[in-house]
Interface confidence: low
């Protein structure tokens, strides 16, 4: 063999005995008939030698060290060559060492070409025997950054003040390139930065510097993770120790692009974040340790990158191309703000543009997907406007207020679907006819269905809420004077199963002056509870509402009011109630601001209840709750 090292190459080659084996026959390096067990070749030297045995790889190892001085002159940056070429070296287990010394203010970056590196812990070895040992320097102290194999995620390691890189190749390995390059960077102001790139699903186990020994005191180390947006990253700590801190606190910090609370600070014993979408940084910060009893800080952790769990990696088509004047918003449910880190939960359009809120508008087909650990953290709110501008065209026209099935197939819960129903002022009114009769929600008989219809005025200046209504009652239709919003609000995931029970038809009808008319057809033996609109806030001033209550031939209706007095005090005008028999037109009139409310009364025929308000004084509002119960006529009511 002949090894010739160019002058000023700053390369030293050392051939020495490896780990002693139990081989009976010793082996020597032979130079000019001299038998030696160690050979050192320096820059500018040329040495010819042989071995005294057939399998020198069982006895000797070779170390090739190149010192790169960036202190006194320019640094040879770029791709690092294996010098001398492996083809010129004896087939021994070989270690190439590059020792780069630089100023404290200079950042050095090792860039690893594909395959990237995978860090291994103490006692582990690389399957192909190729290992990369990387260390840095703090003043005169050497700090072990880690030992790495091929086929991992580590693409770059940035350090300051100097770096030592040792590449160990087994004697049988054909590799003839270093697989990395060196670049200069501005000061990184920390011990090191390790970049880990995930092309797809996978995991990486990483360790603090000097692991399993202690992380250098009061140092900072950062890992930068590059994760494709369609995948999710979770961090878990496999092993850690805390030192005894005199000043400052040992912690990890996460920097997540787009987060409003960067950096997110965690204790090592906290549950670490999961389900992060896109890139993020993790930093380990040491403290000033107690001089008497320092203890050690060390950390071994795993980053797991995978497709979003459950259904959320699917693409959903939301076809709003045939819809008009409609918008669908997917957004986070309101939650109590906590200082704890919450993993990102995003909805993506075209799998690309992801955000925590997304509004889709009518007229297009949209493809959406989710980047979210728990889709119950999101909900959907939809608004659709149905308006009539020409009363001659709309009159008697009907529209079905039905949630489109495309929306129900999304994996996110529907919260509200609101229909804004707009009519020309003083020209048309509206009637809502449910597929199933409705029950008005009251404290006495609350709705327990998975959804309700909330009916309210849609006139900005008017504060009028007709109430909340759910299927399974006695209200056959609701007529309203002018613009309203009808909101289907869901209360349970079981709405998906009960969706068939929804169904409301709105028709445009000739204009009438009353604010609202409820048509009630009670069922036998069930008690129907009804209350005036704007319950708790009081019926608006000068507003009139009516209930048209049907009584079947063979039944008697009992009308009961739940208070003795209405409690309203009028500033101007009078508040009154009219109860009118529909067949005979006989009516009773009660002054609500003066009289006591009627005792329970019995009605053999259909009747009207009409309530009209005055302008009440503040705090003395008109709120009435009453019930209607049917019983068969054959019962002796005396």
């Amino acid at each position: 063999f002949e090894i010739a090292l160019p002058r000023e190459s700053n390369i030293t080659v050392l051939i020495k005995l490896g780990t002693p084996t139990l081989l009976a026959k010793p082996c020597y390096i032979v130079i000019s008939k001299r038998h030696i067990t160690m050979l050192s070749i320096k820059s500018g030297e040329r040495i010819v030698f042989t071995f005294s045995c057939q399998s020198p790889e069982n006895h000797f190892v070779i170390e090739i060290q190149k010192n790169i001085d960036c202190m006194s002159g320019p640094c040879p940056f770029g791709e690092v060559q294996l010098q001398p070429s492996t083809s010129l070296l004896p087939t021994l287990n070989r270690t190439f060492i590059w020792d780069v010394k630089a100023h404290k203010s200079i950042g050095l970056e090792l860039q690893f070409s594909i395959p990237r590196l995978r860090q291994i812990g103490p006692g582990e070895s690389c399957p192909d025997g190729v290992t990369h040992s990387i260390s840095g320097r703090i003043d005169a102290t050497v700090v072990r950054i880690g030992t790495f194999c091929s086929n991992g995620t580590v693409s770059r390691i940035k350090m300051q003040e100097g770096v030592k890189m040792a590449l160990h190749l087994p004697w049988f390995h054909p590799r003839n390139v270093s697989g990395f390059s060196i670049a200069n960077r501005s000061s990184i102001k920390r011990l090191c930065i390790i970049e880990s790139v995930f092309e797809g699903e996978g995991s990486a186990t990483l360790m603090s510097a000097n692991y399993p020994e202690g992380f250098p005191e009061d140092e900072l180390m950062t890992w930068q993770f590059v994760v494709p947006a369609h995948l999710r990253a979770s961090v878990s700590f496999l092993n850690f120790n805390l030192s005894n801190c005199e000043r400052k606190e040992e912690r990890v910090e996460y920097y997540i692009p787009g987060s409003t609370t960067n950096p997110e600070v965690f204790k090592l014993e906290d549950k670490q974040p999961g389900n992060m979408a896109g890139n993020f940084n993790l930093s380990l910060q040491g403290c000033d340790q107690d001089a008497q009893s320092p203890g050690i800080l060390r950390l071994q952790f795993q980053v797991l990158v995978q497709h979003p769990q459950n259904e959320s990696n699917k693409i959903y088509v939301v076809d709003l191309s045939n819809e008009r004047a409609m918008s669908l918003t997917i957004e986070p449910r309101p939650v109590k703000q906590s200082r704890k880190f919450v993993p990102g939960c995003f909805v993506c359009l075209e799998s690309r543009t992801c955000s925590s809120n997304l509004t889709l508008t009518s007229g297009s087909k949209h493809k959406i997907s989710f980047l979210c650990d728990d889709l119950t953290r999101l909900w959907m709110n939809v608004e659709k406007t149905i308006s009539c501008t020409d009363h001659r065209y709309c009159q008697r026209k009907s529209y079905s207020l039905q949630v489109p099935s495309d929306i129900l197939h999304l994996p996110v819960e529907l919260h509200d679907f609101s229909w804004k129903l707009l009519v020309p002022k003083d020209r048309l009114s509206l009637v809502l006819v449910p597929a199933q009769k409705l029950q008005q929600h009251t404290h006495e008989k609350p709705c327990n269905t998975s959804f309700s219809y909330l009916v309210a005025s849609a006139i900005p200046s008017q504060d009028l809420y007709f109430g909340s209504f759910c299927p399974g009652g006695s209200i056959k239709q609701i007529q309203v004077k002018q613009n309203i919003s009808v909101t289907l609000r869901t209360f349970a995931p079981s709405f998906q199963q009960e969706a068939s029970r929804q169904g409301l038809t709105v028709s445009f009808i000739p204009y009438f002056k009353e604010e609202g008319v409820f048509t009630v057809t009670p069922d036998t033996k069930s008690k129907v509870y009804l209350r005036t609109p704007n319950w708790d806030r009081g019926l608006p001033s000068l507003t009139s509402v009516s209930w048209n209550i049907s009584v079947p031939r063979d039944q008697v209706a009992c009308l009961t009011f739940f208070k003795e007095r209405s409690g309203v005090v009028c500033q101007t005008g009078r508040a009154f109630m009219i109860i009118q028999e529909q067949r005979t037109r006989a009516e009773e009139i009660f002054s609500l601001d003066e009289d006591v409310l009627p005792k329970p009364s019995f009605h053999h025929h259909s009747f009207w209840v009409n309530i009209s308000n005055c302008s009440p004084t503040s705090g003395k509002q008109l709120d009435l709750l009453f019930s209607v119960t049917l019983t068969p006529r054959t019962v002796d009511l005396t």
């Epitope: 369609h230 692009p257 979408a277 896109g278 693409i315 690309r352 543009t353 992801c354 955000s355």
Partner: antibody, heavy 125, light 107 residues
């Protein structure tokens, strides 16, 4: 190494047609959005169209001013992107680039990380 | 379409100087701005996206900043090889649109 090589440019008369090709290599063609962008002489870059990735069924979208005249398509078996240009006008004279929309971080489409060398199209009588 | 305006068509600078190239969008583009460098006779090269994220392999003397409608590309210490045309582009919505370009000249 990612490579994009356009071809098919040349001189064409107004009203004529031309088909540009963009041969790609060094990446999984089906996984990336691909775009066509042009640069008229002395003018700003102008986006023409996008061909979305396999996940998005290779759907296309066009600049409003070119919709109807230009058609973008792919041959996934050969990793080639095409731009069929019809009813060409003098104002279509430009260097035509194909580019990969490759920055796959969240919130960032239409970010062109690799471009071809361009192919010159001249529309003149 | 969103209009991207680069007010300076030319900028003259010296090697080692710090230079800032600006770009204004006709509406809020929510940090969805990319910067490209185009050297004579070459195709554009991506430098920055998402307003401030440096693309792989781009020297760290190039930095991007800005939000809303105003964005800036800064070269901290201009090198001779930085002589080129610089374009901004919004990637906020379709169609993506480019600025008219700023030509960086070395004095």
């Amino acid at each position: 190494e990612v490579k994009l090589v356009e071809s098919g440019g040349g001189l064409v008369q107004p009203g004529g047609s031309l088909r540009l090709s963009c041969a790609t290599s060094g990446f999984t063609f089906s996984d990336f959005y691909m775009e066509w962008v042009r640069q008229p002489p002395g003018k700003r870059l102008e986006w023409i169209a996008v061909s979305r990735d396999k996940t998005n069924d290779y759907t296309t979208e066009y600049s409003a001013s070119m919709k109807g005249r230009f058609i973008v398509s792919r041959d996934t078996s050969q990793s080639i992107l095409y731009l069929q240009m019809n009813a060409l006008r003098a104002e279509d004279t430009a260097i035509y680039y194909c580019a990969r929309d490759g920055v796959y971080y969240y919130g960032s489409s239409y970010t062109l990380d690799y471009w071809g060398q361009g192919t010159s199209v001249t529309v003149s009588s | 379409d969103i209009v991207m305006t680069q007010s300076h068509k030319f900028m003259s600078t010296s090697v080692g100087d710090r230079v800032s190239i600006t770009c204004k969008a006709s509406q809020d583009v929510s940090s969805s701005v990319a910067w490209y460098q185009q050297k004579p006779g070459q195709s554009p090269k991506l430098l920055i996206y998402w307003a401030s994220t440096r693309h792989t392999g781009v020297p760290d003397r190039f930095t991007g900043s800005g939000s809303g409608t105003d964005y800036t590309l800064t070269i901290s210490s201009v090198q001779a090889e930085d002589l080129a045309l610089y374009y901004c582009q919004q990637h906020y919505n379709t169609p993506p649109t480019f600025g008219g370009g700023t030509k960086l000249e070395i004095k």
